[in-house]
């Protein structure tokens, strides 16, 4: 970058090279060029010569003043006009940055995705800082009082093998950058309470011709968790409002869920599950589309329409559900 150039003098920023966005700042340039009493000192920002708010301090130094500086990054350099030199002489350069101190991290969440072998912790970092901001995730065993720290710039995956201090932990997040430091509230977790079952996937759909045609959705999960609660939401693709069916599920078999739908309409289905009574849900599965037939023939939609696996298990019990309505968006 600009900071690697050979300098004939120096350039500095007040209050600092990294400063709060919207501040008034001063950039100083001091020439130290052999056999040159600078006639003028010029400033450049991102290669564009600055015209206004330049004040000469003394024979070798000038100041460039910016009001309400809002650019996240800029490369500054300055030059001198030396008598008897045809071209400007480079003095020095500096990269400057503006941004914000971090907000207090909130909504700290830690989950263990089944089979992942990791505890994944995320948080709401708050407003964009624009500058390099690091996060330290503190994990403290409530049983052994041992604390581990993990440095990251976003979320963190912590191997469950490294969580040797029992089942109960306190987790909190510290955010820090050049402009400040903030710490989240502590989250208390129990490892058994934060497991999210293996992803539920819709594999196929079929509409069966009967007095009242019905659509059967086939779906499954590889979870080994016994007590699982699931939701399936569906709507016509032209609608805004989702309908939601709730299920208490045993994934010994591929699930079959029945729906009585309007003919000749394209529907979208999604499913998600959680360990019964626990806090965290899976994200909604990827959308599965099925168009109901106009009238008689049997129509089947298969999972090849998107990247999902088909379990190959035999179809067994039909799960029954309770129809509810929900305005949740995607």
């Amino acid at each position: 970058g600009i900071t690697n150039i050979n300098c004939s003098g120096h350039i500095w920023v007040e209050p600092a090279t990294i400063f709060k966005m919207g501040m008034n700042i001063s950039i100083y340039c001091q020439a130290a060029i052999k056999n040159c009493q600078p006639r003028k000192l010029h400033f450049y920002k991102n290669g564009i010569k600055e015209r206004f708010q330049i004040t000469r301090i003394n024979k070798t130094t000038a100041r460039l003043w910016y009001k309400n500086f809002l650019e996240p990054h800029a490369s500054m350099y300055c030059t001198a006009e030396c008598p008897k030199h045809f071209q400007e002489t480079l003095i020095c350069g500096k990269d400057i940055s503006s941004g914000y101190p971090p907000d207090i991290p909130d909504e700290v969440t830690c989950v263990i995705y089944e089979y992942s072998g990791n505890m994944t912790c995320t948080w709401n970092a708050g407003k964009l800082t624009y500058i390099d901001t690091k996060y330290v995730v503190h994990v403290k065993s409530l049983e052994t009082e041992e604390e581990q720290q993990y440095l990251t710039s976003s979320y963190i995956n912590i191997s469950t093998d490294s969580l040797q201090g029992g089942k109960k932990y306190l987790v909190w997040v510290q955010a820090a950058n050049a402009l400040g430091m903030e710490e989240s509230k502590q989250l208390q977790i129990h490892l058994d309470d934060i497991v999210i079952p293996s992803a539920a996937v819709i594999s196929r759909a079929e509409t069966i011709n009967a007095t009242v045609p019905k659509t059967i959705i086939y779906w499954d999960s590889q979870t080994t968790i016994e007590k699982v609660s699931c939701e399936m939401r569906y709507k016509a693709t032209t609608n805004q409002t989702w309908n939601v069916k709730e299920f208490d599920t045993n994934f010994t078999y591929v699930q079959q869920s029945e729906f009585y739908l309007e003919p000749n309409i394209k529907y979208v289905f999604q499913v998600r599950c959680q360990e019964t009574g626990k806090r965290y849900w899976q994200p909604w599965s990827s959308p599965f589309f099925h168009k109901t037939p106009e009238t008689v023939p049997q129509v089947t939609s298969k999972a090849f329409q998107h990247d999902t696996w088909n379990s190959g298990l035999t179809v067994a019990s039909i799960s029954t559900g309770h129809l509810t309505s929900d305005n949740r968006g995607d």
Partner: antibody, heavy 119, light 107 residues
Framework: QVQLVESGGGVVQPGRSLRLSCAAS????????MSWVRQAPGKGLDLVAD??????????YYADSVKDRFTISRDNSKNTLYLQMNSLRAEDTAVYYC??????????WGQGTLVTVSS | DIQMTQSPSSLSASVGDRVTITCRAS??????LAWYQQKPGKAPKLLIY???SLQDGVPSRFSGSGSGTDYTLTISSLQPEDFATYYC?????????FGQGTKVEIK
């Protein structure tokens, strides 16, 4: 050689508008700053408006007395400088010179165009 | 903005005289000073830039000197064509600013 030819001056009523032009030749137009300097009858020289060179990203400057009324612009494809003067006042009466600067002193000047604001 | 004060505002001199006009800046302008000559009904003409550099085509009887805040234009031997008004201009800090002018008249 460098030539600057102003046009567009004349007599205009207070509150009306006028547009001055300056046709330039004999130099690399967009590498130079261009200015309008005026001289009221029997008075000294005053910088009215300035539009800088390409290296300054064509930054503009206006004297306080003309801010929000005058607009300086340049058409580098036509080597022409303009001054759009709106809401003219009696005190805007002057000879308006187009001037060229590569450093910040004015190296070359046009012959001037007289603007008279009178009812 | 930097203020430029020229003196005298006018002077009377004879052909052959040595004439000196001074210009004082409100702060150090580091030799960023130019001198112009203007004849009635004509555009200003650049005589000197960088306080002491003579513009091409300008007679050598014109010279400039000075540093800091004080600058001088000297005409070593006044010629009939030199009767005109002279202006200084600082271009050390933007915007450039003119002195109020010195009128050189025939005595």
């Amino acid at each position: 050689q460098v030539q600057l030819v102003e046009s567009g001056g004349g007599v205009v009523q207070p509150g009306r508008s006028l547009r001055l032009s300056c046709a330039a030749s004999g130099f690399d137009f967009d590498s130079y700053g261009m200015s309008w300097v005026r001289q009221a009858p029997g008075k000294g020289l005053d910088l009215v408006a300035d539009i800088n060179s390409k290296s300054y990203n064509y930054a503009t400057y206006y004297a306080d007395s003309v801010k929000d009324r005058f607009t300086i612009s340049r058409d580098n494809s036509k080597n022409t400088l303009y001054l759009q003067m709106n809401s003219l006042r009696a005190e805007d009466t002057a000879v308006y010179y187009c001037a060229v600067h590569h450093s910040d002193y004015f190296e070359y000047w046009g012959q001037g165009t007289l603007v008279t604001v009178s009812s | 903005d930097i203020q430029m004060t020229q003196s005298p505002s006018s002077l009377s001199a004879s052909v052959g005289d040595r004439v000196t006009i001074t210009c004082r800046a409100s702060q150090d302008i580091y030799t960023n000073l130019a001198w112009y000559q203007q004849k009635p009904g004509k555009a200003p003409k650049l005589l000197i830039y960088h306080a002491s550099s003579l513009q091409d085509g300008v007679p050598s009887r014109f010279s400039g000197s000075g540093s800091g805040t004080d600058y001088t234009l000297t005409i070593s031997s006044l010629q009939p064509e030199d009767f005109a008004t002279y202006y200084c201009l600082q271009d050390s800090e933007y915007p450039p600013t003119f002195g109020q002018g010195t009128k050189v008249e025939i005595k």
